[in-house]
């Protein structure tokens, strides 16, 4: 039976060009953790494996770093990262829990508003 | 370059243990992954298991119980055991590398493979 | 476990014409396939990793593609040198298996 639950940082928003963390925490079983894997829609971002590390997938190695922890640092964000991204617990002997962040990326406030600013 | 190179030997009665070693040079066996995977006459490549850098293991469920990878470190080598085998072990084995932070779980190096029969 | 089915088992093709393999997980995988090359009397080379990207020194006439739980391995034009067995691997989660071959032949 699978009596764990995943604790999300939910619904998230960064700005266009910054980074943003996506966190996911098992609690509550105490099966054995073998791997997370990190996804969005049908793009594999990264896989955390106990045993071997982290594999980044090619496509998003220039802008996905691994960490904190289990989770997942994505950098130079633009309009398109937006939406939801999965964080994939296999374990064993449970098998696997999900869990979903849906990330918002808004357009910089400083970006748009940067050139009425002059210093004095 | 890496080499791998399987030893052990060719015939093995059945409900006794095979034992095989592989040979590394050209590297490490304490960075990256190493594997053993078999394919009996006619049938599907089958994953063994693996002992990662660290010296930790992971053994396909089918075979759990049944199979020990261990590693000699001062001799870069490492090796399988397999127990109580059945004609049904009869196979190519193949140790590997996997160089999981690069390629995740593709195998980018393989040994030439090593014929063993199950027979009385 | 996860199970690769490959198309079809065997395939005969003649030079310079292109070759098509198909392989099918019986879960989404996402992008997590390799696939490899295994030419007579040898040892089984890797040719692709994460579903389209070639490994080192494989020529640009092979390509993979797909996602989810269709994966296709091509080669646009097929040589002499290309007789083999070619495999397809999942790696989304273990324990990783891989498809049962297909077998490509020189007419």
């Known amino acids: 039976m699978m009596t764990g639950t995943i604790e999300t940082t939910g619904n998230i928003s960064a700005e266009k060009g910054g980074s943003i963390i996506l966190q996911c925490h098992l609690s509550s079983t105490t099966a054995q953790v073998t791997q997370v894997n990190w996804e969005q829609q049908d793009q594999l971002l990264a896989i955390c494996n106990a045993d071997l590390g982290w594999h980044i997938s090619p496509s998003f190695k220039d802008r996905v770093a691994p960490g904190p922890g289990l989770g997942l640092t994505l950098q130079s964000l633009t309009v398109n990262d937006t939406g939801e991204y999965f964080c994939i617990y296999h374990t064993y002997p449970d098998g696997t829990y999900t869990g979903r962040i849906f990330l918002e990326v808004l357009e910089s406030s400083v970006a748009e508003h940067g050139a009425r600013f002059q210093i004095p | 370059e890496v080499q791998l190179q399987e030893s052990g030997p060719g015939l093995v009665k059945p409900s006794e243990t095979l034992s095989l070693t592989c040979a590394v040079s050209?590297?490490?066996?304490?960075?990256?992954?190493w594997n053993w995977i078999r394919q009996p006459p006619g049938k599907k490549l089958e994953w063994i298991g693996y002992i990662s850098y660290s010296g930790n293991t992971y053994y396909n469920p089918s075979l759990k119980s049944r199979v020990t990878i261990s590693r000699d470190t001062s001799k870069n080598q490492f090796s399988l055991k397999l127990s109580s085998v059945t004609a049904a072990d009869t196979a190519v084995y193949y140790c590997a590398r996997l160089d999981f932070s690069n390629y995740g779980g593709a195998v980018d190096y393989w040994g030439q493979g090593t014929t063993v029969t199950v027979s009385s | 476990d996860i199970v690769m089915t490959q198309t079809p088992l065997s395939l005969s093709v003649t030079p310079g014409q292109p070759a098509s393999i198909s392989c099918k997980a019986s879960q989404n995988v996402r992008t997590a396939v390799a696939w490899y090359q295994q030419k007579p009397g040898q040892s089984p080379q890797l040719m692709i990793y994460?579903?389209?990207y070639r490994y080192t020194g494989v020529p640009d006439r092979f390509s993979g593609s797909g996602s989810g739980t269709d994966f296709t391995l091509k080669i646009s034009r097929v040589e002499a040198e290309d007789v083999g067995v070619y495999y397809c691997?999942?790696?989304?989660?273990?324990?990783?298996?891989f498809g049962g071959g297909t077998k490509v032949e020189i007419k």
């Open positions: 994460s579903a389209s």
């Open positions: 691997q999942q790696y989304y989660t273990t324990p990783w298996t």
């Open positions: 050209g590297y490490s066996i304490t960075s990256d992954s």
